[in-house]
C-alpha cells in the first residue's frame, strides 16, 4: 500500500517565498513520520524535512541551506520556503514516510510542483525629478 500525495502543479514565488502544501491520503495523527521536500526531476536535493513523533515537538530542518519551516495538518504538511533565488526555480516533490506504527509506508511519487521564483525587479523612482525642459 502506498500513500497518495497531491501538490499544486505550479506556484510562483513573487517575494522569494512560497508555501507548498503536501496533501496525503493518510492521517498523520499519532504517527511517527518523516515528510520531506525534494528539488529536481531526480529529487537529488533534499530541501527540507519535517519530522513528527507522537511524543515530541515537530522538528523542521534543512541540511542543504534552504530557509524553511513546516506546519502539520492531520493529512498534510505545508513547507514554507523563504529567501529563494531565481536559479532555484525547479520542480519540487513531496515525500512522506511513516515509520511507526508498522508497517512502514511511503508514497507513490507525486507529479511535483514547479516553483517559479520571480526576481525582484526594483524600478527606483527618483527622489527629485530632474530639471524640466521648457
Amino acid at each position: 500500500n502506498k500513500i497518495l500525495v497531491k501538490q499544486s502543479p505550479m506556484l510562483v514565488a513573487y517575494d522569494n517565498a512560497v508555501n507548498l502544501s503536501c496533501k496525503y491520503s493518510y492521517n498523520l495523527f499519532s504517527r511517527e513520520f518523516r515528510a520531506s521536500l525534494h528539488k529536481g526531476l531526480d529529487s537529488a536535493v533534499e530541501v527540507c524535512v519535517v519530522y513528527g513523533n507522537y511524543s515530541q515537538q515537530l522538528q523542521v530542518y534543512s541540511k542543504t541551506g534552504f530557509n524553511c519551516d513546516g506546519k502539520l495538518g492531520n493529512e498534510s504538511v505545508t513547507f514554507y520556503l523563504q529567501n529563494l533565488y531565481v536559479n532555484q526555480t525547479d520542480i519540487y516533490f513531496c515525500k512522506i514516510e511513516v515509520m511507526y506504527p508498522p508497517p512502514y509506508l511511503d508514497n507513490e511519487k507525486s507529479n511535483g510542483t514547479i516553483i517559479h521564483v520571480k526576481g525582484k525587479h526594483l524600478c527606483p523612482s527618483p527622489l527629485f525629478p530632474g530639471p524640466s525642459k521648457p
Partner: nanobody, 121 residues
C-alpha cells in the same frame, strides 16, 4: 551514510529454523526502530517484525509465535529468529532501520539489500 547488511539466509526444510542478522554500520548517532520485511516475486513488501528502541516488539499474525525479533545495540545488530518455517515463508528478507546520523537532526530511513530464505524439501 548508514549501511545495513543482512546475513543468515539459505535453504532450509519445512519445520526448520534460521536466524537472520542485520548489522548497521557507518555514521550512526542512534538506532531507533528496527524491522524486518520480506518480498517474493508475486507479492509486495510484507512486514515481518518490528522492535523499537525501547524493546517493544510487534508481529503480523502470519508469523506471530514462530518468529522472534531481537536487537543488540552494542553490536548495532538486529536479529530475526525464524522457527517452524513453511514454504510460504520463502522470500527475500530485508532489514529496515530508522537511524539518526547527527545529534540534533531527526532520523532517516535505511534499507538493506536483502538475504534470500528458501523453505523447501
Amino acid at each position: 551514510e548508514v549501511q545495513l547488511v543482512e546475513s543468515g539466509g539459505g535453504l532450509v526444510q519445512p519445520g526448520g529454523s534460521l536466524r537472520l542478522s542485520c548489522a548497521a554500520s557507518g555514521s550512526i548517532f542512534r538506532l531507533h526502530t528496527m524491522e524486518w520485511y520480506r518480498r517474493t516475486p508475486e507479492t509486495q513488501r510484507e512486514w515481518v517484525a518490528t522492535i523499537t528502541s525501547g524493546g517493544t516488539t510487534n508481529y503480523p499474525d502470519s508469523v506471530k509465535g514462530r518468529f522472534t525479533i531481537s536487537r543488540d545495540d552494542t553490536k548495532k545488530t538486529v536479529y530475526l529468529q525464524m522457527n517452524s518455517l513453511k514454504p510460504e515463508d520463502t522470500a527475500v528478507y530485508y532489514c529496515h532501520a530508522v537511524a539518526t546520523e547527527d545529534a540534533g537532526f531527526p532520523p532517516s530511513n535505511y534499507w538493506g539489500q536483502g538475504t534470500l530464505v528458501t523453505v523447501s524439501s
